[in-house]
């Protein structure tokens, strides 16, 4: 065979990934690999991830002679050990006036009265703890409730008998019930006064309120 067909182990170099070829015999060679590579021709990237140092659920991503940690959203840093301040990153993390409190590995919301849930978006059902009298209807409000009374009942909790039921107000007067004590309040038409609007008054005095 001609000299041009002679095998020269390192020409061209079989070493890849920056490896350096060294001829060790007539037909043999050895590759000196750059850090992070291995194999007879440096063809293999060494996996640097076994027993990696990524913490708090960080995922190891192999590199060349190194690795990176892909951190969950609440962690950051080289090894996912630095807490992300979600309160800074998300100024509106807590709704309805709630206060954001950063914590290691997350955050919490301190909700104002009447709101609950992770982000204070849930209106607390105040009717769950309300004591509206049976037969009345509870209406949930923010940090409060109100009771809708059936006919004949009055008071904040519908626990009082409605004094207006007996029509105590005369002469077309308006009858209202005091929600605190269940007593009636007559709003007298022009020309009448008294608790029941039964008394005449002088002209010029109008719309008297009388409590009973």
């Amino acid at each position: 065979a001609g000299s041009d067909s002679l095998y020269v182990p390192c020409a061209p170099s079989p070493c890849v990934n920056g490896g350096t070829c060294r001829q060790t015999g007539d037909f043999t060679f050895e590759c000196n690999c750059l850090p992070g590579f291995e194999g007879s021709t440096c063809e293999r990237n060494i996996d640097d991830c076994p027993n990696h140092r990524c913490q708090n659920g960080g995922v190891c991503v192999d590199g060349v002679n190194t690795y990176n940690c892909r951190c969950p959203p609440q962690w950051t840093g080289q090894f996912c050990t630095e807490d992300v301040d979600e309160c800074l990153l998300q100024p509106n993390a807590c709704q309805n006036g709630g206060t954001c409190a950063n914590r290691n590995g997350g955050y919490g919301c301190v909700c104002v009265n009447g709101w609950s849930g992770d982000d204070c978006s849930e209106n607390i059902d105040d009717c769950a703890f309300a004591s509206c009298t049976p037969g009345s209807t509870c209406i949930d409000r923010v940090a409060s409730f109100s009771c809708m009374c059936p006919e004949g009942k009055a008071g904040l909790l519908c626990h009082l008998d409605d004094a207006c039921i007996s029509n105590p107000c005369h002469k077309g007067a308006l009858c209202d019930t005091n929600p605190l004590n269940g007593q009636y309040i007559c709003t007298c038409p022009q020309g009448y006064k008294g608790a029941d609007c039964t008394e005449d008054v002088d002209e010029g005095n109008s719309h008297h309120h009388h409590h009973h």
């Epitope: 640097d48 076994p50 027993n51 140092r53 913490q55 708090n56 659920g57 590199g63 060349v64 190194t66 990176n68 840093g77 080289q78 090894f79 050990t81 630095e82 290691n104 590995g105």
Partner: antibody, heavy 117, light 112 residues
Framework: EVQLVQSGAEVKKPGESLKISCKGS????????IHWVRQMPGKGPEWTGY????????KFNEKFKGQATISVDKSSTTAYLQWSSLKASDTAMYYC??????????WGQGTLVTVSS | DVVMTQSPLSLPVTLGQPASISCRSS???????????LHWFQQRPGQSPRLLIY???NRFSGVPDRFSGSGSGTDFTLKISRVEAEDVGVYYC?????????FGGGTKVEIK
């Protein structure tokens, strides 16, 4: 508050075995590796190795491979550094540490190991 | 392993005066993620090391603002703007960019 509390000082003879401990508290123990750092008298600290409490996997500084073992007991949130046959050259202060903002952010108070015949 | 060289070995300082410690690495400490993992520790006599500065220039919580860090690549500096009596001790730099993590040999700060 993150705390690492180590066992007390030990005086041993060459060839004896030893196990020192580091109890972690104030954080989720399984989520963080525990490192062991050696500091020989009058010298700077040297990273020895670490253990992953969740899996029990360990990684060592090549310089210290085969000289000691690291183990963990998750139930008591405690990591251990153990020698089967001590040498005089093992005399040093041994610290456990945990990562945080920087490498080795939280440290134990140290355990002084003295090996002398 | 990456070799961390600190200078000076010993630093006598006057109270209230500034102090500066240098740390050089045998190779660049810029990680493939773009960050530089160079940290500074203080070790007071008879105590455990304490983190002062992480990632070149970030002060750890509770560290007085008289401590500051700077540098890039292979050259880093820790500065104390006005030395106080409680600053006496040995200061170490540490790199965690390359495996294994390696410390500098230390600089002893003492009062003149």
């Amino acid at each position: 508050e993150v705390q690492l509390v180590q066992s007390g000082a030990e005086v041993k003879k060459p060839g004896e075995s030893l196990k020192i401990s580091c109890k972690g508290s104030g954080y989720t123990f399984s989520n963080y590796v525990i490192h062991w750092v050696r500091q020989m008298p009058g010298k700077g600290p040297e990273w020895t190795g670490y253990i992953i409490p969740g899996s029990g996997g360990t990684k060592f500084n090549e310089k210290f491979k085969g000289q000691a073992t690291i183990s963990v007991d998750k139930s008591s949130t405690t990591a251990y550094l153990q020698w089967s046959s001590l040498k005089a050259s093992d005399t040093a202060m041994y610290y456990c540490a945990r990562d945080g903002a920087g490498s080795f952010t939280y440290w134990g108070q140290g355990t002084l190991v003295t090996v002398s015949s | 392993d990456v070799v961390m060289t600190q200078s000076p070995l010993s630093l006598p300082v006057t109270l209230g005066q500034p102090a500066s410690i240098s740390c050089r690495s045998s190779q660049s400490l810029v990680h493939s993620d773009g960050n530089t993992y160079l940290h500074w520790f203080q070790q007071r006599p008879g105590q455990s090391p304490r983190l002062l500065i992480y990632r070149i220039s970030n002060r750890f919580s509770g560290v007085p603002d008289r401590f500051s860090g700077s540098g890039s690549g292979t050259d880093f500096t820790l500065k104390i703007s006005r030395v106080e009596a409680e600053d006496v001790g040995v200061y170490y730099c540490l790199q965690s960019t390359h495996f294994p993590d390696t410390f500098g040999g230390g600089t002893k700060v003492e009062i003149k």
